[in-house]
């Protein structure tokens, strides 16, 4: 969480941003809130990015003002116009690109004063893993697959029964480049699996951590998946 104070003579307002991550090819949110004003026409929101010549987005007098917008963001940005009046300056970024990563500034002017806060935005690819029993294998085998990751993650297997055990000798992980030549499909196979145990396939890079669990008993198979973004810090 980053909280910025703007000082304009005696007038300052608090602006708060939250560091976040964008999943490339999908839509992302750059989060920013501020002390609201009673008049929408008095609020100016400007989003900037370090190293970019033009603005990322500008909203003033109740509407978008995009004459100074940088071409790399053209047609890809929007604020939540109906929420600006209550202090939401968050930016929706469509079709997140790898190059969207970097330092952003949310800059706010209201009748009360001005303020700004920076936001670190990471970009990559992350997806939920699915763990299945590989019935085609010669021995009891589990197969963990996740369709899109970038940068290349690490994959670690764990088990509820053998806590702390190192499964690197009995597992094999491969990364297959997807058709867009950036993201990769992650496939990890775990051999010599025992029944009545819960196994976890943990995939992690510097942006996200995802876990796929599978519980195999003689009568049923239970699965559960979980994904967590790693860098959600507020400013």
């Amino acid at each position: 969480l980053i909280i910025g104070f703007g000082i304009s003579g005696r007038h300052s307002i608090t602006v708060t941003t939250v560091a976040s991550a964008g999943n490339i090819g999908e839509d992302g949110i750059l989060s920013c809130t501020f002390e609201p004003d009673i008049k929408l026409s008095d609020i100016v929101i400007q989003w900037l990015k370090e190293g970019v010549l033009g603005l990322v987005h500008e909203f003033k007098e109740g509407k978008d003002e995009l004459s100074e917008q940088d071409e790399m963001f053209r047609g890809r940005t929007a604020v939540f116009a109906d929420q600006v009046i209550v202090g939401n300056a968050s930016l929706r970024l469509k079709n997140v690109q790898l190059t969207d990563a970097g330092t952003y500034k949310c800059y706010i002017i209201t009748s009360k004063g001005k303020g700004n806060a920076n936001l670190e935005y990471k970009t990559g690819a992350f997806s939920m893993p699915e763990v299945n029993v590989d019935y085609n294998a010669s021995s009891e085998t589990l197969r963990c697959e996740a369709p899109r990751w970038f940068p290349q993650p690490t994959v670690v297997w764990a088990s509820q029964v053998d806590q702390g055990a190192n499964f690197s000798e009995v597992s094999n992980t491969s990364f297959e480049l997807n058709s867009e030549n950036v993201t990769m499909k992650v496939v990890s196979v775990l051999y010599n699996v025992t029944i009545n145990n819960t196994y976890s396939c943990m995939i992690e890079n510097d942006i996200a951590k995802a876990t796929g669990d599978i519980k195999v008993t003689e009568s049923e198979i239970k699965r559960r998946s979980h994904l967590q973004l790693l860098n959600s810090k507020a400013s």
């Epitope: 304009s8 190293g51 100074e68 790399m72």
Partner: antibody, heavy 120, light 107 residues
């Protein structure tokens, strides 16, 4: 220490060419846009050109458009200004400058300048 | 292009004086304004950004105010080191433009 160091200035005849360099140190060069600003003898400051951190986007003053080209090599932490078809009115001290989000895109770091003289 | 007009072009003052320099933009630039100090043979030095924010390391006798089209730089008590030329500059749009400068000289 954050530093910008220009080089490549000198005496050139009208119609000639010159390439200025600006070596950056002390900061992550590729993260920042960069600009060239010039100052004719006894005159004020004039912005010349800017380039984005990636090098993919550029902007020029009308007075140099079509004659000057700004570029950068992020692997060498160096900014360039290729000046062609030089005129007497291009005579100036040329500064490279770094704008920053921290200073709302004002130029917080400047080089010491390099003198370009266009004369026959 | 946004034109930046500074006044006066020359200002004679004494140590201890309160000095005010004005900068006017040809269209609204919100608070996208910076002030620089330049001494002969040296590169400009950033004093004020965002119209009123003091750059780190700059003495507090320097202050900036204004928004929209009218801006001022004030030196509350002129010191010997302050005799120099001062420029305003807009960062609202390209091309970036500077004011013509104000030379503060000893009376």
């Amino acid at each position: 220490e954050v530093q910008l160091l220009e080089s490549g200035g000198g005496l050139v005849q009208p119609g000639g060419s010159l390439r200025l360099s600006c070596a950056a140190s002390g900061f992550t060069f590729s993260s920042y846009a960069m600009s060239w600003v010039r100052q004719a003898p006894g005159k004020g400051l004039e912005w010349v050109s800017a380039i984005s951190g990636s090098g993919g986007s550029t902007s020029y003053a009308d007075s140099v458009k079509g004659r000057f080209t700004i570029s950068r090599d992020n692997s060498k932490n160096t900014l360039y200004l290729q000046m062609n078809s030089l005129r007497a009115e291009d005579t100036a001290v040329y500064y490279c400058a770094k704008p920053s989000l921290a200073t709302m895109l004002a130029f917080d770091i400047w080089g010491q300048g390099t003198m370009v003289t266009v004369s026959s | 292009d946004i034109q930046m007009t500074q006044s006066p072009s020359t200002l004679s003052a004494s140590v201890g004086d309160r000095v005010t320099i004005t900068c006017r933009a040809s269209q609204s630039i919100s608070s996208w304004l910076a002030w620089y100090q330049q001494k002969p043979g040296k590169a400009p030095k950033l004093l004020i950004y965002d119209a009123s924010s003091l750059e780190s390391g700059v003495p507090s006798r320097f202050s900036g105010s204004g928004s929209g089209t009218e801006f001022t730089l004030t030196i509350s008590s002129l010191q010997p080191d302050d005799f120099a030329t001062y420029y305003c500059q807009q960062s609202k749009s390209y091309p970036r433009t500077f004011g013509g400068g104000t030379k503060v000289e000893i009376k």
